[in-house]
């Protein structure tokens, strides 16, 4: 008869690589006597016999897992025991190989140039796969602009043009390659204006041909603009080669003019344009111009660039050695002085001033100004200024303001034409929305169009100062 | 409150003169151009004329170019039409409407009623 | 002078039922500022006109927004979207563009 032996576990567990979806299997050979029973852990929970995932054999000392999951990492141990002597234990790893996988791969982009761009490329595998691009048909390479990052994603800094291409992503380790589908990286690029219009001066009943050349991705289109508006005569060429568009207007010139190249592509839902601008004169009218009081031109300043209508030409006063510095001086110095009006003032006197100081401008033998409508003006004083009219007329009548101390150039309502008499004879600005609650004799008048941005400034008293010789009444 | 209330309701021959008042209160009288509107018994509205009362300047629609007078005082507030010789075809509501500063009539009389029968 | 045309002149309409009045002028009435100096009034029976929308597409302080206008240069359209016992009356366009301002002819609202 056999002595009773306790349980010796002869082949310990040892460490075991198994790829994803294959067999991985233990072996703990037991000498004992009697035959112990033998179980199974994994992370130190007992695994069940009738567990599908697993199969075990001959008598315990074989555990197979028969299709092994990502999730099968970890320490596998068999205990031994027959009840002579202690149980014993020995314990070996599982670690899942996995080929390489790409979880996210890259998707197609289209980026506006100098702008960031990241392709993404996330990636699963044991080892950890190394993440690589290719571009084309070629390894792309890091540079100061272009990394992989930690994640695989490519992430490419100040988009260039010669970024535009066609990418893959491929995740590697020591059991394989993956390999991404290919993926398109389309730069777009702002409409640029390359050869600008130049400026002529002719004869009357001249031909002039005005020619604008604009770059960009999309191809930009090319318009032109005549005084402000679209031009009404003259034909246009177009041709396009290499994403350059060539634009040649043809003019018969009968009158000086204004004419503006505008170049424009789409983003998405947005657009870039960039205009360049050129006049025509004419060599006869140069005389009959010089005589009159100014000319007309495009506003090229900043101060009233928001308030003033695009493109528009403005007059500019020739009795000024410099017009269009002087005027831009002014209205600087006008702005100054209305940062210390209410939010409700602010705009509306903003856009009187700049539209008495720029004055629209019909370009002729003689230019001639278009003064703002009476009306117009009125509101401002009576309507969102009142207050600081009041306190500035105050202030005025107190002798607080000498002459050409705070020189703002405020029209005189009551010189201004009237929108009621000829309504060409003076312009007619947007309207204004004024709310009751800012004014207490005046009605409310609620506006289902945008009405012009009040900014939200600090409520004050202060008046913007108002020499008495530019009264409005 | 603005307001603009106009004189009462008038019965007259024909031959006869008439002047009608439309005052203004709480606000500007003179910073705002005064309209008349006649409406003629179920009929629509015709825009007759303005003034601006701060210098009496005055436009008429040329249909009642030199039928009528449009006058106004601005030390009381107050606005006029009149017509030195009535005819029956005068019949009508006139109303004053002020202008605001962007065109549109944006305060009203309460109307007067003219009626010229012989 | 500028001729201003409405149509229907007569409207008859079910209560909650939307409405539509056409304006057409015979010059454009659309200025440099981008707005179209027209506007729409309401007179109500036995009533003085009242303002209901200014430069075109602006709601008057008080007016219902059920009231909305439209349209641009020499077409315009009042709605009602849904038309209510209290908005009877007649509707007239105006233009304020050059003088003499003219008037349509007015268009009658009733309630079926």
């Known amino acids: 008869e056999k002595l009773p032996k306790a349980p010796v576990i002869t082949t310990p567990l040892e460490t075991v690589d198994a790829l994803v979806e294959e067999v991985a299997t233990f072996m703990c050979a037991v000498e004992s006597y009697p035959q112990p029973e033998i179980s199974w852990t994994r992370n130190k929970i007992l695994i069940k016999l009738f567990d599908t995932r697993y199969s075990i054999r001959e008598n315990g000392q074989l555990l197979t897992i028969l299709s092994v999951e990502d999730s099968d990492d970890g320490i596998y141990c068999c205990i031994a025991n027959n009840g002579v002597g202690g149980a014993v234990e020995s314990c070996g790893a599982l670690q899942v190989k996995m080929k390489p996988k790409i979880t996210r791969p890259p998707i197609n982009v289209k980026i506006i140039e100098g702008l960031k761009a990241v392709l993404p490329c996330t990636t699963m595998g044991n080892p950890k796969p190394s993440v690589s691009w290719i571009k084309g048909d070629n390894a792309l390479r890091e540079n100061s602009r272009i990394a992989v990052l930690e994640s695989g994603s490519l992430r490419i800094h100040n988009v260039q043009k010669e970024d535009a291409g066609q990418y893959r992503c491929v995740a590697k380790n020591s059991l394989g390659t993956a390999y991404s589908k290919l993926v398109k990286l389309e730069v777009e690029v702002f409409a640029r204006i390359l050869r600008a219009p130049e400026s002529h001066n002719v004869t009357f009943g001249s031909f002039v041909t005005l020619r604008c050349t604009a770059i960009g991705i999309p191809v930009p289109t090319i318009s032109w603009i005549e005084n402000g508006n679209a031009v009404s005569s003259g034909s246009i060429q177009e041709s396009v080669k290499d994403r350059v568009i060539d634009s040649r207007l043809q003019l018969f010139i009968t009158k000086p003019g204004l004419y503006t190249c505008i170049a424009t592509n789409k983003h998405g839902e947005k657009f870039s344009t960039a205009k360049a601008a050129a006049t025509v004169s004419i060599a006869e009218w140069s005389k009959s111009q010089k005589d009159s009081q100014g000319y007309c031109a495009q506003y090229r300043g900043e101060v009233c660039d928001a308030v003033l209508a695009k493109d528009a030409l403005v007059f500019f006063n020739t009795s000024y050695r410099d017009p269009e510095d002087a005027q831009e001086l002014l209205i600087h110095t006008a702005w100054n002085e209305l940062k210390a009006v209410s939010p409700l003032c602010r705009p509306a006197a903003e856009a009187l001033l700049c539209n008495h100081l720029f004055q629209e401008c019909s370009p002729g033998v003689v230019p001639t100004p278009m003064p703002i409508c009476r009306e117009y003006c009125l509101a401002v004083k009576e309507l969102f200024c009142a207050k600081e009219w009041q306190a500035m007329e105050g202030k005025a009548h107190r002798g607080l303001y000498r002459s050409g101390m705070h020189l703002l150039p405020v029209p005189e309502c009551s010189k201004l034409p009237s929108m009621h008499r000829d309504p060409t004879a003076c312009t007619r600005l947007p309207y204004l929305d004024y709310k009751k609650e800012n004014i207490t004799t005046f009605p409310s008048i609620t506006s289902s169009r945008p009405s012009a941005d009040i900014p939200n400034l600090p409520a004050s008293t202060s008046s913007f100062a108002v020499s008495p010789a530019y009264s409005m009444t | 409150e603005v307001q603009l209330v106009q004189s009462g309701a008038e019965v007259k021959k024909p031959g006869e003169s008439l002047k009608i008042s439309c005052k203004g209160s709480?606000?500007?009288?003179?910073?705002?151009?005064i309209g008349w509107v006649r409406q003629m018994p179920g009929k629509g509205l015709e825009w007759m004329g303005i003034?601006?009362?701060?210098?009496?300047?005055?436009r008429y629609s040329p249909s009642f170019q030199g039928q009528v007078t449009i006058s106004a005082d601005k030390s009381i507030s107050t606005a006029y039409l009149q017509w030195s010789s009535l005819k029956a075809s005068d019949t009508a509501m006139y109303y004053c409407?002020?202008?605001?500063?962007?065109?549109?009539?944006?305060?009203w009389g309460q109307g007067t009623l003219v009626t010229v029968s012989s | 002078d500028i001729v201003m045309t409405q149509s229907p002149l007569s409207l008859p309409v079910i209560p909650g039922e939307p409405a539509s009045i056409s304006c057409r002028s015979s010059?454009?009435?659309?200025?440099?500022?981008?707005?179209?100096?027209l506007d729409w009034y309401l007179q109500k029976p036995g009533q003085s006109p009242q303002l209901l929308i200014y430069?075109?597409?602006n709601r008057a302080s008080g007016v219902p927004d059920r009231f909305s206008g439209s349209g641009s240069g020499t077409d315009f359209t009042l709605k009602i979207s849904r038309v209510e016992a209290e908005d009877v009356g007649v509707y007239y366009c105006?233009?304020?563009?050059?003088?003499?301002?003219?008037f349509g002819q007015g268009t009658k609202l009733e309630i079926k």
């Open positions: 409407a002020r202008h605001s500063h962007w065109g549109f009539l944006d305060y």
């Open positions: 709480g606000y500007s009288f003179t910073s705002y151009w």
């Open positions: 003034i601006y009362p701060g210098d009496s300047d005055t």
């Open positions: 010059q454009s009435l659309l200025q440099s500022n981008g707005y179209n100096y």
């Open positions: 430069l075109g597409s």
């Open positions: 105006m233009q304020v563009q050059q003088t003499p301002y003219t």
